[in-house]
């Protein structure tokens, strides 16, 4: 689609005669016709088939044609058309005399013609005028011409439709040609196709807009490149989404089990080496002058009782010193001058001659100890109890009282939360940093599995031995009915077989 | 050949919220070159533009319905809903689903055969 | 709000030329879709881009759009084509459908 445009400049008809050279009465009253149509090798009378365009009178005689084109679009004259441009054309420019105020043809006489003129050729599609003179015995007429597409047409041919848009269906502009020329920020053959933020990721990221980067499910970060891991994962890390790979020294589904304590939280004090015994369990061995769980109470170096044979302890910078009672010598007064016959042993220990009688030995009686019998026995000056736990001495015998959490003669056993089997329903126990989490079988839920869901408690068969299950409505359990023989919430014990339990 | 099938209840009472979705076949919802759009058509009215999205989930309203519009897509399901809150009688209408072709201009190529919804207590 | 108005009606007797207008502001400047929709049935694209056919519609249907006019016309109308026609165009983000022409 595009216009055939033609602007008349100048008309000379100097005598103001028509074209059968008679004079026109009172001077010539000018109009044109113009008739567009295809190429023709020699221009002959016919259907304008390019269109028609006829003028009012312009002029008399001589006259130049001013532009009108503000005024009405007289000047230069407009010659549609709704189809490809060929490129050639034959065009007939035909000046009229008017008699009167009827211009059409058939109101006309034969006549009253002036000029006829005829061209064809090639003409392009462009914006520049082509300028032409036709001159004839008595007249000559100056006009120019061009061919434009139509608004939104474009191409050579004034064929391709192209329309600028800015909604979802094109972000573009159009090129002379009738190519898209999209705008900032959008590609894709249409222009609809957003260009996501530099560097977001083409597989994890996407944008609806440009320069956005949002992130498809189990993605993060600002170019969508970050994997989310496992939600509640503590210390892990992913390399796809929903892993929880545990960092080094931590374990468990959501890596929040605390395999090295000692690294971690470094507990043991004045230089103390920490030794990991389990999960969130450790044991410090303190240097010498410490004691305490984390090595944290400084400790005299007389506490130990170095001092044998009733010697006394004083401290000192740089260690401790014995004053030994009469009869004895030696850094811990452990050397005798006594013999037996001095009834050395106290507590009732028995006394028993060395080396031909120049020393002795006391044999203690239980509760005793010490080069004399002399000391009770402290079963608990050795720090025995691990993990914080309160040594009791218990007569002969001591006992290490553990703090929540542990177990065992010394508390040298973390206990599991698991250990009591909280989970109901044969649900599995998971240790966790804060408790517990029971994983339950099918037909159970809540936090220790206790509640049945739409499963009938017996579908499992949970009783042995030939035993009716009842399904108890009320608590949601099962009943075993054992046969003759068997007994145990389940039917499990022959009768007469005691149950070994784990504990 | 694409097709599309509405589905949904076809009595909503007023107040509530119409719900119906949209089911693809015969071809992929996750193309850049289309639209997914709803149209309706009040009993011997004219044809009434709701809204559309394409398969990442950006959407366009009519203004004049967008508060309570909402039209969502499941590229799973191949399928894309619409959901039309505090419903009144002028909402009575059958409801299209159409595909609205980039290459095309925007021209709803396929359509649904339409469902009736009415509103009513 | 952007509006496209179309004549409620339009008669032609079969085998001659139906025209159909649908008038909005600067209407040519956007492109236009027609559709075709017979009673009882969902709306068929007859012709999208101004004046472009989808495969399958007949050479009697076409369409221009300049100015503030879009026409599709029918040339050699049959009986089969009696029917509802609404003009429709986007406005920026929105689908706009003209109030629709019954040709009979």
């Known amino acids: 689609s595009g216009v055939f445009q033609l602007q008349l400049q100048e008309f000379i008809n100097e005598r103001g005669v028509l074209a059968s050279g008679r004079p026109c009465e009172p001077g010539c009253r000018t109009f044109f016709r113009v008739c567009l149509k295809h190429f023709q090798a020699v221009v002959s009378p016919g259907p304008c088939t390019f269109g028609t365009v006829s003028t009012p009178v312009l002029g008399t005689n001589s006259f130049a044609v001013r532009d009108d084109s503000s005024g009405g679009g007289r000047n230069p004259l407009q010659l549609p058309f709704n189809f490809t441009w060929p490129g050639t054309f034959s065009l007939i420019i035909e000046a009229w005399h008017a008699p009167g105020d009827d211009l059409r043809p058939e109101a006309l006489p034969p006549d009253a013609l002036i000029s006829k003129i005829a061209i064809q050729g090639s003409l392009a599609v462009g914006q520049n005028w082509l300028l032409d003179e036709q001159t004839s015995t008595l007249t000559r007429l100056r006009y120019s011409y061009r061919v434009i597409c139509s608004d939104n047409y474009y191409g050579d041919n004034c064929s391709r439709l192209c329309k600028k848009r800015n909604d979802h269906f094109g972000h573009y502009v159009c090129q002379p040609d009738g190519n898209l020329s999209c705008l900032p920020g959008w590609t894709g053959e249409y222009c609809q196709q957003p260009i996501c933020l530099s560097g977001c990721h083409e597989q994890n990221g996407y944008c609806s807009k440009p320069a956005e980067c949002l992130c498809r499910p189990g993605w993060q970060g600002r170019l969508c490149n970050e994997c989310i891991p496992h939600n509640g994962c503590r210390h892990g890390t992913c390399s796809t989404p929903w892993q929880c790979t545990c960092d080094e020294g931590w374990g468990g589904l959501f890596c929040d089990q605390d395999l090295n304590y000692c690294t971690h939280h470094s507990p043991c004090k004045n230089g103390a080496t920490c030794s990991n015994s389990g999960q969130r369990s450790y044991t410090c061995t303190c240097r010498p002058g410490y004691t305490g769980v984390d090595c944290e109470l400084e400790l005299s170096e007389c506490d130990s009782n170095p001092c044998r044979n009733g010697g006394s302890c004083k401290d000192q910078e740089d260690g401790y010193h014995c004053l030994c009672p009469p009869g004895y010598y030696g850094l811990h007064c452990e050397h005798s001058t006594l013999s037996c016959a001095d009834s050395p042993c106290f507590n009732g220990g028995s006394c028993r001659e060395r080396n031909q009688g120049a020393n002795y030995a006391c044999e203690c009686p239980p509760n005793f100890t010490g080069s004399n019998c002399e000391k009770k026995v402290d079963r608990c000056t050795s720090n025995p109890c691990a993990n914080g736990g309160q040594c009791l001495n218990r007569g002969p015998s001591r006992m290490c009282r553990c703090r929540p959490g542990f177990t065992g003669t010394y508390c040298e056993l973390h206990v599991s939360d698991c250990a009591r089997n909280p989970c109901a329903h044969g649900g599995t126990c998971h240790d966790l940093e804060n408790g517990l989490m029971c994983t339950c079988p099918a037909g159970f839920s809540g936090r220790r599995c206790e509640v049945r869901t739409s499963i009938d408690a017996c579908a499992s068969s949970p009783c042995f031995n030939r035993a009716t299950c009842y399904t108890d409505l009320s608590t949601d359990t099962f009943v075993c009915n054992c046969p003759y023989g068997f007994v145990g919430s389940r039917c499990e014990f022959p009768v007469g077989l005691p149950p070994s339990f784990p504990w | 050949e694409v097709q599309l099938q509405e589905s949904g209840p076809g009595l909503v009472k007023p107040s509530e919220t119409l719900s119906l979705t949209c089911t693809v076949s015969?071809?992929?919802?996750?193309?850049?070159?289309?639209?997914w759009g709803w149209i309706r058509q009040p009993p011997g009215k004219g044809l009434e533009w709701i809204g559309d999205i394409n398969y990442i989930g950006s959407t366009y309203y009519n203004p004049s319905l967008k508060s309570r519009v909402t039209i969502s897509v499941d590229t799973s399901k191949n399928q894309f809903s619409l959901k039309l809150s505090s419903v009144t009688a002028a909402d009575t209408a059958v409801y299209y689903c159409?595909?609205?072709?980039?290459?095309?201009?925007?021209?709803?190529?396929?359509w649904g055969q339409g469902t009736l919804v009415t509103v009513s207590s | 709000s952007y509006e496209l108005t179309q004549p409620p009606s339009v008669s032609v007797s079969p085998g001659q030329t139906a025209s159909i207008t649908c008038s909005g502001d600067?209407?040519?400047?956007?492109?236009v879709s027609w559709y075709q929709q017979k009673p009882g049935q969902s709306p068929v694209l007859v012709i999208y881009?101004?004046?472009q056919r989808p495969s399958g519609i007949p050479e009697r249907f076409s369409g221009s759009n300049s100015g503030d006019t879009a026409t599709l016309t029918i040339s050699g109308t049959q009986p089969m084509d009696e029917a509802d026609y609404y003009c429709?165009?986007?406005?920026?983000?929105?689908?706009?459908f003209g109030s629709g022409t019954k040709v009979t």
């Open positions: 429709q165009a986007w406005d920026s983000e929105t689908g706009v």
């Open positions: 159409a595909r609205e072709s980039v290459p095309l201009g925007g021209g709803a190529d396929e």
């Open positions: 600067m209407l040519g400047d956007k492109y």
């Open positions: 015969g071809g992929s919802i996750s193309s850049s070159s289309y639209y």
């Open positions: 881009e101004d004046s």
